[in-house]
């Protein structure tokens, strides 16, 4: 039975040209996290594997940095980066947990972080 929950940074906004940290946290389970995948729609951004370390997809190497922790830092943001991002936790024995973050990249300097929320 999957008892864990993923807490994410929720709906967030950031300025064009700036950077943002995408963060998820898995709680309420003793399952072992073997890998976390970061995806944007159907595109793989990055992998953090417990044994292998990090892998950044070649097309994102210049704008994506690993961490902090299991999170992901997006740099040199453009309006095209607006959209849904997913953290996919591969765990044993539970299976897969998925968290969703919506990022809005703004032209103006008015960019505020949204509230945190949980996804079961």
């Amino acid at each position: 039975m999957m008892t864990g929950t993923i807490e994410t940074t929720g709906n967030i906004s950031a300025e064009k040209g700036g950077s943002i940290i995408l963060q998820c946290h898995l709680s309420s389970t003793t399952a072992q996290v073997t890998q976390v995948n970061w995806e944007q729609q159907d595109q793989l951004l990055a992998i953090c594997n417990a044994d292998l370390g990090w892998h950044i997809s070649p097309s994102f190497k210049d704008r994506v940095a690993p961490g902090p922790g299991l999170g992901l830092t997006l740099q040199s943001l453009t309006v095209n980066d607006t959209g849904e991002y997913f953290c996919i936790y591969h765990t044993y024995p539970d299976g897969t947990y998925t968290g969703r973050i919506f990022l809005e990249v703004l032209e103006s300097s008015v960019a505020e972080h949204g509230a945190r929320f949980q996804i079961p």
Epitope: T34, I47, G67
Partner: antibody
């Protein structure tokens, strides 16, 4: 004695296929993450593929879409199915075990003797 | 990928003398959350597979003689053989695993 023994190497034409096997003994195979690492003749080492104890899989970009890693814990065996082989895949292929520690050291602690794969027409 | 650059490519050392091998990574391999450097050293003798000597940059693997030691942090690392023995003739590789694993090009150690 902890041991890994590879087999299945040989000469294959470009575009051909080969399946490598690695037989493990002397340890609880199902508890360990396993890898394939290759070494071209006279060259350095290149990590190829990984499979965790729970089945999570990763590949080097150079083999993604062509190679498939799998394991059979009941048979204490690791496999690498290699398709669409190229001349640059010519190498000794080693299976290697990930070291287990209190926190992951991310190092390969046990290696097999290797099996040679030659891709040539 | 992180590029691992070893130097020198080869070195000849007299028996009983010190051998020093350097490894430089193109990015830091220090993981701040646990303060560990994900850097390992391997020894490969002719016709044999690699053998793990050191992990976390400075922790010796069980059974490895204490004449082998590793040091360094961030991007610059060193493997030292304090008193070279005949059986130490081999190629030595560093490997990072902050990102998916990559290896240095190797350093060949011979007897002078």
């Amino acid at each position: 004695e902890v041991q890994l023994v590879e087999s299945g190497g040989g000469l294959v034409q470009p575009g051909g296929s080969l399946r490598l096997s690695c037989a493990a003994s002397g340890f609880t195979f199902s508890s360990y993450s396993m890898n394939w690492v290759r070494q071209a003749p006279g060259k350095g080492l290149e990590w190829v593929s990984y499979i965790s104890s729970s089945g999570t899989i990763n590949y080097a970009d150079s083999v993604k879409g062509r190679f498939t890693i799998s394991r059979d814990n009941a048979k204490n065996s690791l496999y690498l199915q290699m398709n669409s082989l190229r001349a640059e895949d010519t190498a000794v292929y080693y299976c290697a075990r990930h070291r287990i520690a209190d926190s992951p050291s991310r190092a390969f602690d046990i290696w097999g003797q290797g099996t040679m794969v030659t891709v040539s027409s | 990928d992180i590029v691992m650059t070893q130097s020198p490519d080869s070195l000849a050392v007299s028996l009983g003398e010190r051998a020093t091998i350097n490894c430089k990574s193109s990015q830091s391999v220090l993981f701040s959350s646990n303060n560990k450097n994900y850097l390992a050293w391997y020894q490969q003798k002719p016709g044999q597979p690699p053998k793990l000597l050191i992990y976390w940059a400075s922790t010796r693997e069980s059974g490895v003689p204490d004449r082998f030691s590793g040091s360094g942090s961030g991007t610059d690392f060193t493997l030292t053989i304090s008193s070279l023995q005949a059986e130490d003739v081999a190629v030595y590789y560093c490997q990072q695993s902050y990102f998916f694993p990559t290896f240095g090009g190797g350093t060949k150690v011979e007897i002078k």
